[in-house]
């Protein structure tokens, strides 16, 4: 066969569906890879062909478009299993072309088994809630495209394995489920199960996604930074170690870029001559708040490394904060015989 | 089938406290949570707050935290609404809802509480 | 807070003819999941409020289709397309986007 633009295997788009539910699967050429979309291509004379290779299996292979009750089906760019069976498993090729074109991509479908209480390897999304912030709402995800807005599904959310009926401050409204307030207590797996009819059949779509509860902006505040302060000298002699904890607390901030650097002498460790490590960890509240420490380290300070200047620095979408260490050079303890004995008039 | 039944009228003085009831049958009492809501004479609705009848947490709206109280007897089925300090405003009638989707769609028949030297 | 403004009274209206109730909300009620977060409420003399529509033109359960609602965001129409006598109250509009729910003042439905 002639030529064809292979995008090759897109893993990043790899689909999972849960096994005997309907699923659609839109070709990702015109989505990712084509700058047109396929109505353009269709009325250009171009057709869209699938075909699949079995999981193991190195052979491609047509798709059957002929199996009972057309349970395979393709309309438009869109590939229809109604519904899906654990042995679909594969990577799948859409091939657009025509004589003198052609562009194909392959992507991986795993059809995943779910027990009773919605557990399965399918990974799911996480949606943040922020804690005690009034009304918040999730949605029903992916469920468009699957029946008319003329059909009426009937939608059941679970919290893990139980039905919410009403769990007080969660409330189902349909395709969403309403959060009056959330609370920690609200963290964990929601599913929705949509049931809708179609041709005289009942399918069903289960979706699950992760609820976590944040810590709200209206509690946020800038980096505060724990250490250094001004409570803590670092006094060291030349020789010895110095190692000087910067410790900040962010507030969860959606989206925010938390950052913590060291100076010296207003240089970032990098650009200066001095022997420095610098190890950061990282620990996270309940509701996502965040502390760092990056511990500034020099094996063996030296009498002008204790006269440099050693600035935390720390910022987030709600601010910049630093703060300076001090640090000083320890004066010797006095040795008795000379330095005492002259301080009584010892001759 | 689901129905609130609150407590009678009261007619209060100034400074005393009142404590209204709202009792529910027809449902299990700790799946939904219940809200109040505020109809001073020849007025409009404004909604009070709320109470998470599972755990008893209250949440009030701004304009009735200090002097307004929510709680539960949940062996009873029953809210309350406990207002301290009556002043001459309180008067009004007030009625329990219970929170579930569509909202609002079970009310009490209200309480009308007077404030009057 | 959402405020939600109603005129005190209707234009008077004679039975069998057709109604409508105007409320306007300060804040968009379009919620980013597609729905609209305003809800009409009647209060009949003498009774409790009693739910009518919900997310903006669903009908309550119970509730006659001689009762429909629509709107924008912001601008919101309750219809009522032949008023019978037993439609006399006062409409209330609300919003549950957010919290506090908060409630218009109320419109009084007059009959000439």
């Known amino acids: 066969s002639e030529r064809c633009d292979d995008w090759g295997l897109d893993t990043m788009r790899q689909i999972q569906v849960f096994e005997d539910e309907p699923a659609r699967i839109k070709c990702p050429l015109f989505e990712h890879f084509l700058k047109f979309n396929y109505s353009t291509a269709h009325s250009a004379g171009l057709t869209l062909i699938w075909y699949w290779t079995r999981q193991d299996r190195d052979l491609e292979e047509p798709i059957n478009f002929r199996l009972p009750e057309n349970r395979i089906s393709k309309e438009k760019d869109v590939l229809w299993f109604r519904p899906t069976l654990l042995n679909d498993t594969g990577n799948y090729t859409c091939m657009l072309r025509n004589t003198t074109y052609c562009s194909k991509v392959a992507f991986p479908l795993e059809v995943v088994q779910k027990d009773s209480c919605f557990n399965s390897p399918m990974k799911l999304p996480v949606h943040k809630l922020y804690i005690e912030y009034g009304i918040q709402r999730i949605t029903c995800p992916n469920v468009d495209g699957y029946f008319p807005s003329s059909v009426k599904p009937t939608i059941t959310w679970y919290m893990g394995c139980y039905k919410i009926q009403n769990f007080n401050n969660v409330i189902p409204e349909g395709m969403n489920l309403s959060f009056l307030i959330a609370l920690i207590s609200n963290n964990g797996n929601y599913t929705c199960v949509v049931t809708y009819p179609e041709n005289g059949r009942t399918f069903h779509l289960t979706r699950t996604l992760t609820v976590k509860v944040v810590g709200s902006p209206k509690n946020a505040v800038p980096p505060v930074i724990h250490s250094p302060n001004d409570h803590v000298v670092y006094e060291k002699e030349p020789g010895e170690e110095l190692l000087i904890p910067c410790t900040v607390y962010f507030s969860f901030l959606m989206d925010s870029r938390n950052e913590v650097w060291w100076t010296i002498d207003g240089k970032k460790p990098d650009d200066i001559t001095i022997d420095v490590t610098i190890n950061e960890s990282i620990s996270h509240s309940r509701t996502e708040d965040e502390t760092r420490t990056q511990i500034l380290s020099i094996k063996k300070v030296t009498s002008e490394d204790l006269k440099r200047s050693y600035v935390c620095h720390a910022r987030s979408a709600k601010g910049e904060v630093a703060k300076a260490a001090k640090v000083k050079q320890k004066v010797p303890a006095p040795r008795y015989t000379v330095e005492l004995a002259c301080g009584f008039g010892a001759t | 089938q689901i129905q609130l039944v609150q407590s009678g009228p009261e007619l209060k003085k100034p400074g005393e406290t009142v404590k209204i009831s709202c009792k529910a049958s027809?449902?299990?009492?700790?799946?939904?949570?219940m809200h109040w809501v505020k109809q001073a004479p020849e007025k409009g609705l404004k909604w009070m707050g709320w109470i998470n009848t599972e755990t008893g947490e209250p949440t009030y709206a701004d304009d009735f935290k200090g002097r307004f109280a929510f709680s539960l007897e949940t062996s009873a089925s029953t809210a309350y609404l406990q207002i301290n300090n009556l002043k001459n405003e309180d008067t009004a009638t007030y009625f329990c809802?219970?929170?579930?989707?569509?909202?609002?769609?079970?009310w009490g028949q209200g309480t009308l509480v007077t404030v009057s030297a | 807070d959402i405020v939600m403004t109603q005129a005190a009274f209707s234009n008077p209206v004679t039975l069998g003819t057709s109604a409508s109730i105007s409320c306007r909300s300060s804040k968009s009620l379009l919620h980013s999941n597609g729905i609209t977060y305003l809800y009409w409420y009647l209060q009949k003399p003498g009774q409790s409020p009693q739910l009518l529509i919900y997310?903006?033109?669903n009908l309550a359960s119970g509730v006659p289709d001689r009762f429909s609602s629509s709107g924008s965001g912001t601008d919101f129409t309750l219809r009522i397309s032949r008023v019978e006598a037993e439609d006399v109250g006062v409409y209330y509009c609300a919003q549950n986007l957010e919290l506090p729910f908060t409630f218009g003042s109320g419109t009084k439905l007059e009959i000439k």
């Open positions: 997310q903006m033109s």
């Open positions: 809802a219970r929170g579930s989707f569509p909202w609002f769609t079970y």
């Open positions: 027809g449902y299990t009492f700790t799946d939904y949570s």
